[in-house]
């Protein structure tokens, strides 16, 4: 499903993908929050920005995709498929798969989805901020 190796992407292309991911992450979180009475858990942490946070490897795309794929096993909101497709564009072809254990308890499943969805939304905000501030520095 990888159409272009990520190192061929221009910073402007990466920014467009991250902007789209930011929008999709907000939609996912909005729908997930419809399930009232579910609280965020401290047990799950989504990796976000890479240490240098520079294009093309601005975010931990393989790990983030692995978490979203785990959510996809538990929930069939189609926005998740689209998020995974966009994350695919930001991944080197030889990226190793991250293993994530799927919660089995019903309520824990919901907490996992809410927690990762919220962290993913915050991560996309951070990534976009990092990209735009980097772009501004490059032009000055």
């Amino acid at each position: 499903s990888h159409t272009l190796p990520v190192h061929f992407l221009q910073p402007s292309d990466i920014q467009k993908i991250v902007e789209e991911l930011q929008s999709l992450s907000k939609m996912l979180l909005k729908d997930v929050k419809e399930d009232k009475g579910v609280l965020v858990s401290q047990n799950y942490t989504l990796p976000c920005l890479t240490p240098d946070a520079q294009p093309p490897n601005i975010i931990h795309s393989p790990a983030i995709r692995a978490y979203l794929k785990t959510i996809r096993q538990l929930d069939n909101k189609s926005v998740i498929d689209e998020i995974i497709e966009h994350l695919d564009k930001l991944i080197f072809q030889d990226a190793p798969e991250t293993n994530i254990s799927v919660p089995t308890d019903t309520h824990e499943c919901k907490r996992f989805i809410l927690t990762i969805s919220q962290q993913f939304s915050e991560c996309m905000d951070l990534a976009l901020k990092s990209l735009t501030s980097g772009a501004q520095q490059a032009t000055t």
Epitope: K30, N76, K77, S78, C109, K110
Partner: antibody, heavy 124, light 110 residues
């Protein structure tokens, strides 16, 4: 009590059109489930037609054979999902059901809900 | 294209018999599988969801099992009211799958 009620069925000539409605009551069009149309020809099995997501985006998924002639839509203010059927053929004669399916594997059986169905007959 | 293959298409059995119906998906559906019972002129009635969870009000003689691509519905001791048609269905949605139904299994009196 949650229920789905189909209407709009009837007799139509080949090449004609019909719009079926699926009215939801006892629950609101908020998020986290799909509403689908399924049909059953006389003496035959269940056949999935199309689904629409009730949530931030009205994502739709069609059975490959249904694309082009069948269109699903929804009106949140009326809590209703529609199925527009065009260029109808004799083989479209069936009972048309609407059904609700959960978007979460962890959800309980109450998320599964079927209407009683509406009869569509295509004949000259 | 995604397919759900259900077998057998029909079977004859007696009251008290153990009945097994299988459903095979052409790709993994991660336990997003439901089983229904349908009687003539009625909508399908949910028996099992999430591959193995018994729907409320359904007798415990019905059970579901399986994962990945292979799933089974078992009726441990067939009762007179169980003579009907049974369908498996995936509700995984999205992706490359969709909401497929099996072809059905008609259970009749031997």
């Amino acid at each position: 009590q949650s229920q789905l009620v189909e209407s709009g069925g009837g007799s139509v000539q080949p090449g004609g059109s019909l719009r079926l409605s699926c009215a939801a009551s006892g629950f609101s069009f908020s998020a986290n489930y799909w509403i689908c149309w399924v049909r059953q020809a006389p003496g035959k099995g269940l056949e999935w037609i199309v689904c629409i997501y009730i949530g931030s985006r009205a994502d739709t998924y069609y059975a490959p054979w249904a694309k082009g002639r069948f269109t699903i839509s929804k009106d949140n203010s009326k809590n209703t999902v529609y199925l527009q059927m065009n260029s109808l053929r004799a083989e479209d004669t069936a009972t048309y059901f609407c059904a609700r399916f959960s978007s979460g594997i962890y959800d309980l059986d109450r998320f599964f809900l079927w209407g009683q169905g509406t009869q569509v007959t295509v004949s000259s | 294209a995604f397919q759900l293959t259900q077998s057998p298409s029909s079977l004859s059995a007696s009251v008290g018999d153990r009945v097994t119906i299988t459903c095979q998906a052409s790709q993994s559906i991660d336990s997003w599988l439901a089983w229904y019972q349908q009687k003539p002129g009625k909508p399908p009635k949910l028996l099992i969801y999430q591959a193995s969870k018994l729907a409320s009000g359904v007798p415990s003689r019905f059970s579901g099992s399986g994962s990945g691509t292979d799933y089974t519905l078992t009726i441990s001791s067939l009762q007179p009211e169980d003579f009907a048609t049974y369908y498996c269905q995936t509700y995984y949605g999205g992706g490359h799958i969709g909401w497929g139904f099996g072809t059905g299994t008609k259970v009749t009196v031997l």
